[in-house]
């Protein structure tokens, strides 16, 4: 509305896997005759306005964010102000603002969504021997080091959802990754298969685990 420099970023969040590099795209339209000496570029955390990376006084001032950020110097003159964030961590998740100042100034915010896939669930049974129809057992489904928090679903061998008597807990480790433990209490039939599905809502990734109880003995599917 003011004729100020127009800064463009993706509307959708940028999804990055933990440990990988992410590019936060940002662009502006340089006017004819534009030179990098005119450019002042600031990347910052949106909420706090804490400096992440800057390009001022005609040069890259470097990373102010754990030395894990970089610009694309060869592309700046064409209006590419994107930021490379290396070795993404859970703590990086959030909104980043790209602030561009040339003759005037403008800004735009881009969201970083961090994700990590969950491991294939391991299944344990308690008690795990001398089982008879009518016994109550607890089946525990454990999946590790995922992000964000998982959705857990249980079903029987016929694909019927099991929603009662399920307790799910999720604990974050020091890196912010979640370990999920879901416990199903069930009364055994003559035989049966019990499956747990751990879903990462961001990656739309499903990790499956199942246990089959056939009187004596019980069998566990081999690990994939």
């Amino acid at each position: 509305p003011t004729g100020a420099v127009e800064v463009q970023v993706p509307e959708d969040p940028v999804v990055a896997l933990v440990g990988t590099d992410a590019t936060l795209r940002c662009s502006f339209s340089p006017e004819p005759g534009f030179s990098l000496a005119q450019l002042n570029l600031i990347w910052q955390l949106t909420d706090t306005k804490q400096l992440v990376h800057s390009f001022t006084e005609g040069r890259d001032q470097g990373s102010a964010y754990a030395n894990r950020t970089a610009l694309f110097p060869d592309l700046l003159a064409q209006g590419n102000a994107s930021l490379r964030l290396q070795r993404v961590r859970v703590a990086d998740e959030g909104s980043f603002t790209c602030f561009v100042s040339i003759r005037d100034f403008g800004s735009a915010a881009v969201s970083l969504q961090v994700a990590a896939p969950y491991s294939k669930p391991s299944m344990t049974l308690e008690p795990n021997k001398d089982l008879r129809p009518g016994d109550t057992v607890t089946i525990t489904c454990s999946s590790y080091r995922g992000y964000p928090e998982a959705e857990v679903f249980w079903q029987d061998g016929q694909g019927v959802p099991l929603t009662g008597n399920v307790t799910t807990s999720q604990m974050a480790n020091e890196q912010g990754l979640f370990d999920v433990h879901s416990v199903l209490r069930v009364v055994l039939g003559a035989n049966g298969t019990y499956s747990c599905l751990v879903r990462n809502p961001v990656l739309q990734q499903d990790a499956h685990g199942s246990v089959t109880i056939t009187g004596q003995p019980m069998t566990f599917p081999p690990e994939a």
């Epitope: 600031i42 910052q44 909420d47 100034f105 800004s107």
Partner: antibody, heavy 124, light 109 residues
Framework: QVQLVQSGAEVKKPGSSVKVSCKAS????????INWVRQAPGQGLEWMGG????????NYAQKFQGRVTITADESTSTAYMELSSLRSDDTAVYYC?????????????????WGQGTTVTVSS | DIQMTQEPSLTTSPGGTVTLTCRSS?????????ANWVQEKPGQAPRGLIG???KRAPGTPARFSGSLIGGKAALTITGVQPEDEAIYFC?????????FGGGTKLEIK
Amino acid sequence: QVQLVQSGAEVKKPGSSVKVSCKASGGTGGIYLINWVRQAPGQGLEWMGGIIPLFGTANYAQKFQGRVTITADESTSTAYMELSSLRSDDTAVYYCARDQVVATSGVNFGMDVWGQGTTVTVSS
Amino acid sequence: DIQMTQEPSLTTSPGGTVTLTCRSSTGAVTTSNYANWVQEKPGQAPRGLIGGTNKRAPGTPARFSGSLIGGKAALTITGVQPEDEAIYFCALWYSNLWVFGGGTKLEIK
């Protein structure tokens, strides 16, 4: 403690221009936006524009485009707002207000420091 | 033009709690709008109370808090004091400019 001290009251004729100054003192380092905000009698606050003194770049509200010029002199820590083609409805109190572009403390306090205001009266 | 809507006036009692809101014509207010709340009393310059949605400026009493509620910026005063009678303006940042709301006149009875 940062303070913003503005120039004194002005009485101007319609069609003329006025230039108001805003001097920052006390811990003026960092990257700041100096905003100019006015308040006409009995009215609310109205953002006119702002400048980043360190970069010398300014933006203006559409309503004032072409009639307002905001400048800054980094060496004296002073920002200026010049409004031309004055009309009677430009009679107002004009304020400068500091806003952080980058929060060096890691906390964004927003427009936390305001000048005392400069009364501009436009009358024939 | 971006329009911002505040309650024209609100009345509360000393010791009570009151919430002032600020709605934007562009849709939900987000953290990237850096909602500011400014207090103005007769004959005094405006005073910045809250910046960055919920950060109290130095000197702002703890009874003032900022937040986002239902897509609007909000200022809550908990344990209202007689000296809180004033006009409160919100301001939102839109990429390259600030826009002020029309103000809420808070009366303490």
